[in-house]
């Protein structure tokens, strides 16, 4: 009688992560008596995947009824495949004994796993920056296989070119990660702007995956100040206004000083929003001229978003 052969008909099998993989194996004879075992890898470090005789293998099921006496099909199905399952699987026939001894191995089936990249996560700088400054954004996506992936950066739909991308690890791996850093120059009009990281991979049936960051979380637009004297409202009263224009974010505190002495402090509340997303605000101070013998120096002092105060002064002439 011809010697038993272990036949693994598939040289390679490719599976999507999350699916089940069927690994085929048949033997050509019922002799010698003894169990079948499945291993991943070869040599002393091989990993036992399934033992027909004993053990608990919750993700592995036999395709046919391997307990039947005449059974010669020892194909298995491995459920919920992840990239970590990739490798070469061997169907090995053992001869019954004490202990069982390895009799013959199949040629092996290479299991390749395709896995989608995770949704890209874009993160910006920890602190806000002002227009004309360059800030860095990072984009990360993980867990994909094969390694080939493309990553693009956009600002408001315009592709960016100043970025560096790494795919790790450099060598062979079950899955990969991508990390990219883009440099973006801020402008005063960027409150409504978005930075987008776009990742394309062979496993994606839809459009590329996108991660976004709103520049509103990154930018600080400092205000411009203008102090003006309004026409006299009453005989002894002058209305002085401080126009605080084009600032972002809204967090702003204004202090009026009369000849260096604090007169009033208020927080920006009823602001008006400009088309570009920045804010305007106006504060006014009613000055009683009759209380002053000399000219009055009025100062509008603004502390914006925790930054050092900026101020604008106005000299109020007191006529004798």
């Amino acid at each position: 009688e011809e010697e038993l052969q272990v036949i693994q008909p598939d040289k390679s099998v490719s599976v999507a992560a999350g699916e089940s993989a069927i690994l085929h194996c048949t033997v050509t004879s019922l002799i010698p008596v003894g169990p079948i075992q499945w291993f991943r890898g070869a040599g002393p470090a091989r990993e036992l995947i399934y033992n027909q005789k004993e053990g608990h293998f919750p993700r592995v099921t036999t395709v046919s009824e391997s307990t039947k006496r005449e059974n010669m099909d020892f194909s298995i199905s491995i459920s919920n495949i992840t990239p970590a399952d990739a490798g070469t699987y061997y169907c090995v026939k053992f001869r019954k004994g004490s202990p069982d001894t390895e009799f013959k191995s199949g040629a092996g089936t290479e299991l390749s796993v395709r896995a989608k990249p995770s949704a890209p996560v874009v993160s910006g700088p920890a602190a806000r920056a002002t227009p004309q400054h360059t800030v860095s954004f990072t984009c990360e996506s993980h867990g994909f296989s094969p390694r080939d992936i493309t990553l693009k950066w956009f600002k408001n739909g315009n592709e960016l070119s100043d970025f560096q991308t790494n795919v790790d690890p450099v060598g062979e791996s079950v899955s990969y990660s991508i990390h990219s850093t883009a440099k973006v120059v801020l402008t005063r009009e960027d409150v409504h702007s978005q930075v987008i990281c776009e990742v394309a991979h062979v496993t994606l049936q839809g459009d590329p995956l996108r991660g976004t960051a709103n520049l509103s979380e990154t930018i600080r637009v400092p205000p411009t100040l203008e102090v003006t004297q309004q026409p006299v409202r009453a005989e002894n009263q002058v209305n002085v206004t401080c126009q605080v224009r084009k600032f972002y974010p809204q967090r702003l505190q204004l202090t009026w000083l009369e000849n260096g002495n604090v007169s009033r402090t208020e927080t920006a509340s009823t602001v008006t929003e400009n088309k570009d997303g920045t804010y305007n605000w106006m504060s006014w101070l009613l000055v009683n001229v009759s209380a002053h013998r000399d000219d009055v120096k009025l100062t509008c002092q603004v502390e914006h978003d925790g930054q050092p105060a900026v101020s604008k002064s106005h000299d109020l002439k007191v006529s004798a």
Epitope: A16, S112, V202, T203, Q205, G206
Partner: antibody, heavy 116, light 109 residues
Amino acid sequence: VQLVESGGRLGQPGTSLTLSCTVSGFSLSSYVMGWFRQAPGKGLEYIGIISSSGSPYYASWVNGRFTISKTSTTMDLKMNSPTTEDTATYFCARVGPLGVDYFNIWGPGTLVTVSS
Amino acid sequence: DIQMTQSPSSLSASVGDRVTITCRASQSINSYLAWYQQKPGKAPKLLIYSASFLYSGVPSRFSGSGSGTDFTLTISSLQPEDFATYYCQSWHYISRSYTFGQGTKVEIK
């Protein structure tokens, strides 16, 4: 799982023509779909694809000559201003479940003849 | 755009022969290569994807190999139903575009 093309006929140069690919057994919202053509006695040529979310992508030579769109059960190919060089059998196909690098299901094709 | 060069453009062989068709890409496509069989008046049928993976239901006499720029389709023992035209098709992961080889017609000797 099945794809069937329709709309192939004898058309005049410059007169737009729309081909349809009707799918059954799966959802168009889950797969990338493609259009291909084959001139008589020639090889296969890629025209374009439409993503599962409905975004079309075209071969570099297309230059606005074709428009790909889809509804819930059909994918359309509009030939905007056909010439006699567009005479061919047009195939629709679905990409494989593992990725967009190959096409595992094809329709039987529909013949378009452009002639004056 | 990537060019795919298939050779030979045609070949004559007998039943039982071992047949090899090659496909060369003008730049690396890694393993993103598929092989199709087409018979006259019919749609293409997928044989091999990812350069070496046999599509389900395809006889094991078909095999594919290669990566980068050079690829091979092998029919280990030609059967009467294998007389057809064979096409290679690449996918480029950067341009996300597809290109076909010009085809190889396998005829009866």
